[in-house]
Interface confidence: low
């Protein structure tokens, strides 16, 4: 995670567009970096992150990383550029509107990661593919 005082480099000031040529705006993601979590043995969890940030670059997506070891469980929420690996893994699901957790091999811990590209999508992390679509939509508000 890039600490708050380190400025990310910006390659250029070109306007970013999607595949259809529409201007792509920076999206909103939960951005609490690493915090302790009580999320365990559940089909889905809320991040309990109260900071929503406007991602710095239009191409960035939302990422959540769930880690469990012998001592604790943590949940990391950030913005990240899907062209770059995160925790040494490629963000394969960056285009998904929902954050569907996938297990990754990490020695000494249980490690799940997901990425997604709708506003605040890393607020609701889903461990079961059978996502309950009857859940009410999250209120998409800035910084809330």
């Amino acid at each position: 995670t890039i600490p708050p005082h380190v400025q990310k480099s910006v390659n250029n000031d070109m306007i970013v567009t999607d595949n259809n040529g529409a201007v792509k705006f920076p999206q909103l993601c939960k951005f609490c970096d690493v915090r302790f979590s009580t999320c365990d043995n559940q089909k889905s969890c809320m991040s309990n992150c109260s900071i929503t940030s406007i991602c710095e670059k239009p191409q960035e997506v939302c990422v959540a990383v769930w880690r469990k070891n012998d001592e604790n469980i943590t949940l990391e929420t950030v913005c990240h550029d899907p062209k770059l690996p995160y925790h040494d893994f490629i963000l394969e699901d960056a285009a998904s509107p929902k954050c569907i957790m996938k297990e990754k091999k990490k020695p000494g811990e249980t490690f799940f990661m997901c990425s997604c590209s709708s506003d605040e999508c890393n607020d609701n992390i889903i461990f079961s593919e059978e996502y309950n679509t009857s859940n009410p939509d999250l209120l998409l508000v800035i910084f809330q």
Partner: antibody
């Protein structure tokens, strides 16, 4: 050298309107979220409003929602605060500041020198 | 909203003194706490972010500590230019909120 220079403050009657401006230089304005923070005479600091780097998203503190509107012109490196239906309790020095919401940079730095808004009949 | 309470509201000190200002949050804010210095008629200036990280260009006599609900700003040896008002600010949740300020005056 980073500079934020506010203007547009002044004396206005209750119910009136003002538009504040903040001219920015010395950093890549279009890459950063910006905020307005105010300070009533002799009082502490209160965050008022924020806007995303691209200008497509804004957020206000509850007490000004529906009355104040933050905007920006990235081609002019300028931040604005349109203040309508002004009340006596809106009397304050208004500061513009870089920050709040870009990639977890949830602090304000740097700040402009401020512009005084006085609401009085 | 999270309430931030600073103490004391004012203090008198001499050049060379060690000064400590405390800030308490109404709920746990982890380490999401910033400190600012403001001189009369001037804009606030960021001193410390994330509870203990010194902002670039700020003298090392300033330090911050704490996590959860209780935080401290310490000036190890007060200098003439340090007489000012100091504010804490939480960035754990929106809206960001400030303490009421602590005025450091010359004894």
């Amino acid at each position: 050298q980073v500079q934020l220079v506010e203007s547009g403050g002044g004396l206005v009657q209750p119910g009136g309107s003002l538009r504040l401006s903040c001219a920015v230089s010395g950093f890549n304005f279009r890459r950063y979220a910006m905020s307005w923070v105010r300070q009533a005479p002799g009082k502490g600091l209160e965050w008022v409003s924020a806007i995303s780097a691209s200008g497509d998203r804004t957020h206000n503190t509850d007490s000004v929602t529906g009355r104040f509107s933050i905007s920006r012109d990235n081609s002019k490196n300028t931040l604005y605060l349109q203040m309508n239906s002004l009340r006596a309790e809106d009397t304050a020095v208004y500061f513009c500041a870089k920050g709040l919401a870009a990639s977890g940079k949830n602090y304000f730095d740097p700040w402009g020198q401020g512009t005084l808004v006085t609401v009085s009949s | 909203d999270i309430q931030m309470t600073q103490s004391p509201s004012s203090l008198s000190a001499s050049v060379g003194d060690r000064v400590t200002i405390t800030c308490r949050a109404s709920q746990s804010i982890s380490s999401y706490l910033n400190w600012y210095q403001q001189k009369p008629g001037k804009a606030p200036k960021l001193l410390i972010y994330a509870a203990s990280s010194l902002q670039s260009g700020v003298p090392s006599r300033f330090s911050g500590s704490g996590s959860g609900t209780d935080f401290t700003l310490t000036i190890s040896s007060l200098q003439p230019e340090d007489f000012a008002t100091y504010y804490c600010q939480q960035s754990y949740s929106t809206p960001p909120t400030f303490g009421q300020g602590t005025k450091v005056e010359i004894k």
